[in-house]
């Protein structure tokens, strides 16, 4: 069986809230991921949870990788096994998953100074929506390789996926709705696949006329013999996924093909605000791999509206302001902690702030509510003091950032926080200061003297 792994470990894990974190979509059946290690003389290749398949389609740099290796170090024309999967994926905390590979072979590598090679890959769920990043080598010593990979696949699956054609819940941080792409009245999209025609009807339960009541969302018809009709994915078996900047609709559970696999279809959506067909666009067949049929589809309905699309800056006439220098994205960065001199050490509250983004759930802020942009932590727990919902504004010579819709604070009200950012040239280090809190704990005000609040430039025009 060409798909059978030599070495493989479980590639998903459940967190304490029983939410599934699933790295299976990252597993490569052929080829491998190149790790960014800023050293042109060596290349480190990895697969996720299973070995690099060097027998099937071995790439030129991977040809020499020993069987079973999931981490292969290539130096010149030589390749070395520096790690094989041993233990399954581990959750080290809510936003971090760890995979460990060790070299099982007894013989030591001469460049490892007597140490046994090992690879640790830490998958980090980013604090905001972002495109995929390459796995990065963060430390290397005596053949111990530490890799960090910031990817949304490390986030819990409810954040990434939906069984419907929309992603718009609180969970998901985005607003996507593909339901307008559904065709009614028995019509369907047609995509030319050289020797086949594909009929598609997405986001609905409309029978495709050609498809013999197969409940197909994607139907494959042989051009030379139109009686040969196969379901290439059924509308009951649908997953919409938005991860690492990629929007994908998957239909599985189609008719079996000769290899024994069930046919499935993967539709890769791209945002195109000028798509034809009233913005709907049309699917284009791009190829088939192992009974999986791939399509790309340019449509305005794939233009993802993100909460993070809110501008992290402000304009005032021709003056531009940009607060993005203050944004904390992912570890090893840390949240800003506000200075609060008003309380004794015993009743001390810690105020954690991020700009234009949720606070990072690290350190004392680990228990903060997931979507809080400002969070207060004391001995009783944590509180959401406001979410990033509206863009910064220019007000009275300063930049005003208002975070709203925090935790309930009584009388049907929610906590709100104002941050006033005051221009202080050359200072990007100073922390915000708590100025006031009032209205029965419903309102907080911080002041922040920072270079990020200084005018950036005059806009052209």
């Amino acid at each position: 069986d060409i798909f059978k792994a030599n070495k493989e470990v479980p590639c998903y894990v459940f967190d304490e809230e029983l939410r599934k974190h699933d790295l299976n979509p990252l597993i490569k059946l052929s080829g491998a991921y190149l790790v960014d290690d800023s050293d042109p003389d060596t290349s480190l290749f990895i697969n996720v949870c299973r070995d690099i398949d060097t027998l099937r389609d071995p790439g030129s740099q991977l040809r020499a990788c020993p069987p079973g290796t999931a981490a292969c170090l290539v130096r010149g024309h030589q390749a070395f096994d520096v790690g094989q999967p041993r233990d399954g994926l581990k959750l080290v905390r809510k936003d971090r998953l760890v995979l460990s590979y060790v070299r099982e072979e007894a013989g030591k590598l001469d460049f490892c100074d007597g140490h046994s090679p090992a690879v640790t890959i830490t998958f980090v769920c980013p604090s905001e929506r972002r495109e995929g990043t390459i796995p990065k080598l963060t430390a290397k010593s005596n053949c111990r390789y530490e890799i960090e990979w910031i990817t949304e696949y490390a986030c819990h699956r409810d954040y990434l996926e939906s069984k419907t054609c929309s992603l718009s819940g609180e969970q998901q941080d985005v607003s996507i709705d593909l339901t307008p792409l559904a065709q009614s009245g028995g019509s369907s999209y047609i995509s030319d696949g050289k020797e086949y025609l594909f009929y598609l009807n997405v986001c609905g339960e409309t029978e495709i006329q050609f498809c013999n009541k197969k409940q197909a969302a994607v139907c494959q018809v042989k051009k030379s013999d139109t009686s040969q009709v196969k379901a290439a994915g059924r509308y009951h078996n649908q997953t919409l996924r938005y991860s690492d900047g990629d929007l994908t609709l998957i239909y599985f559970g189609g008719d079996e093909c000769s290899s024994g696999f069930q046919r499935m279809s993967v539709i890769n959506f791209e945002c195109n605000k000028t798509a034809g067909n009233d913005g709907k666009g049309t699917p284009v067949f791009t190829g088939e791999v192992d009974c999986t049929y791939f399509f790309t589809w340019d449509t305005e309905y794939a233009c993802v509206k993100e909460k993070e699309d809110l501008l992290c800056g402000a304009t005032d006439g021709k003056k531009r302001y940009d607060l993005s220098a203050l944004v904390r994205h992912a570890e090893p960065e840390q949240n800003w902690e506000a200075v609060d001199g008003s309380q004794t050490e015993t009743e001390k509250k810690h105020f954690f702030i991020n700009i234009c983004h949720r606070v990072l759930q690290e350190g004392k802020a680990r228990g903060c509510p997931e979507d809080a942009a400002v969070c207060a932590v004391d001995k009783n727990g944590s509180k959401n003091l406001g979410k990033f919902i509206s863009s910064p504004m220019k007000e009275k010579g300063n930049i005003q950032l208002s975070y709203s819709d925090g935790d309930d604070c009584g009388h049907g009200k929610k906590i709100k926080t104002n941050i006033t950012l005051v221009c202080k040239p050359g200072d990007l280090e100073s922390a915000p200061v708590l100025r006031t809190s009032g209205e029965g704990g419903c309102f907080y005000e911080f002041e922040w003297h920072t270079a990020a609040a200084c005018v950036l430039s005059k806009t052209e025009g």
């Epitope: 490569k28 052929s30 080829g31 491998a32 991921y33 190149l34 960014d36 389609d57 790439g59 030129s60 740099q61 991977l62 495109e131 995929g132 990043t133 390459i134 900047g245 990629d246 993967v266 890769n268 791209e270 791009t286 190829g287 088939e288 791999v289 999986t292 791939f294 790309t296």
Partner: nanobody, 128 residues
């Protein structure tokens, strides 16, 4: 067996030209996207240009626009990167890479993450 072999690198003076070749074997040539990448000492690998062998679609990184040109010769299963007006900052090891076009989002074809197979690289040095 998928194999990628780069050639054509060397030492060239600023303002000079070089043509790199990436010859592929072991796979259905027109089912792949071929990308050119480079890696300078101490830096990460970055995308330069890419080409969909099937339909001829092309993409360039901003740093390559107007100076570099990617092309293909289907009879020879080869993709070329013609580099003109070379600058010292173009000094790097240049790699070609391949990925099956079926699953590739072509607009992301300058992303290292997307590629499955890599060549060994060829050194380009721009110096007077």
């Amino acid at each position: 067996q998928v194999q990628l072999q780069e050639s054509g690198g060397g030492l060239v003076q600023p303002g000079g030209s070089l043509r790199l070749s990436c010859t592929a074997s072991g796979f259905t040539w027109d089912s792949y996207v071929i990308g050119w990448f480079r890696q300078a000492p101490g830096k990460g690998r970055e995308g330069v240009s890419c080409l969909d062998v099937d339909d001829g679609s092309i993409y360039y990184h901003d740093s390559a626009k107007g100076r570099f040109s990617i092309s293909r010769d289907n009879a020879k299963n080869t993709v070329y990167l013609q580099m003109n007006s070379l600058k010292p900052e173009d000094t790097a090891v240049y790699y070609c890479a391949a990925v099956n076009r079926a699953s590739m989002r072509f607009r992301r074809c300058l992303q290292v993450l997307r590629y499955d197979y890599w060549g060994q690289g060829t050194q380009v040095t721009v110096s007077s």
